[in-house]
């Protein structure tokens, strides 16, 4: 619980408890904002980020980008409040102590976007159709 | 009983340096994740500094990074941190914290104040 010597400010978002009352400590995340990648046609990719960091706020989760376009690939580490839209996309997968990469619809690239909630969790991007729940028959064996 | 008892705060110019000190007792010290903390007056919780068990893995926050260096010592179960540079808004109260999925241990913390 909040130790009592520990000031509870007023409109004060940076002490957020869980459901046992202790305070919820920050993530540990990969941030190395954009960076070029080598990262293609693989399972899953390392983020070659070598810069860890505490995220500000308790209520931050880790994310990645990954987005391929005609010139380029690059991929994106950071942390980020799931109640927030990241890149105008609502962070469905927040939860997930793993980072599985989903594609979304943008224009003119190819874009793929993961958070989690573990530790270090963006630093291992996956792409598997193995690792992804919208896949029927991973869902029938969970199910079973 | 986890007790963590901070020392090392005062008063000292800007510019200049402090080094706290966490003594650890109660607990297996290289089984957690230790933690510096602060809060200045009237403010949230500022998450400074994070080092692993066995002290291999150190964490800094941005507006601390370059400038203080978090250790610790597992045979005196004893956490550090070593400020350098010191500027007016790292004034707050320094808690040392331990966490686990469970529960979280605070010390009383101790006070820096960085003024001329």
């Known amino acids: 619980t909040i130790p009592p010597h520990v000031q509870k400010s007023v409109n004060n978002d940076m002490i957020v408890t869980d459901n046992n009352g202790a305070v919820k400590f920050p993530q540990l995340c990969k941030f190395c904002d954009v960076r070029f990648s080598t990262c293609d046609n693989q399972k899953s990719c390392m983020s070659n980020c070598s810069i860890t960091s505490i995220c500000e706020k308790p209520q931050e989760v880790c994310v990645a980008v990954w987005r391929k376009n005609d010139e380029n690939i690059t991929l994106e580490t950071v942390c980020h409040d799931p109640k927030l839209p990241y890149h105008d996309f609502i962070l469905e997968d927040a939860a997930s102590p793993k980072c599985i990469m989903k594609e979304k619809k943008k224009p003119g690239e190819t874009f793929f976007m993961c958070s989690c909630s573990s530790d270090e969790c963006n630093d291992n991007i996956i792409f598997s159709e193995e690792y992804n729940t919208s896949n029927p028959d991973l869902l029938l064996v969970i199910f079973q | 009983e986890v007790q963590l008892l901070e020392s090392g705060g005062g008063l000292v110019q800007p510019g200049g340096s402090l080094r706290l000190t966490c003594a650890a007792s109660?607990?297996?010290?290289?089984?957690?994740r230790m933690w510096w903390v602060r809060q200045a007056p009237g403010k949230g919780l500022e998450w400074v500094s994070?080092?692993?068990?066995?002290?291999?893995?150190?964490y800094y926050a941005d507006s601390v990074k370059g400038r203080f260096t978090i250790s610790r010592d597992n045979s005196k179960n004893t956490l550090y941190l070593q400020m350098n540079s010191l500027r007016a808004e790292d004034t707050a109260v320094y808690y040392c914290?331990?966490?686990?999925?469970?529960?979280?241990?605070w010390g009383q913390g101790t006070l820096v104040t960085v003024s001329s």
């Open positions: 994070a080092i692993d068990p066995q002290g291999q893995h150190t």
């Open positions: 914290a331990k966490h686990n999925s469970s529960f979280d241990y």
């Open positions: 109660g607990f297996t010290f290289t089984d957690d």
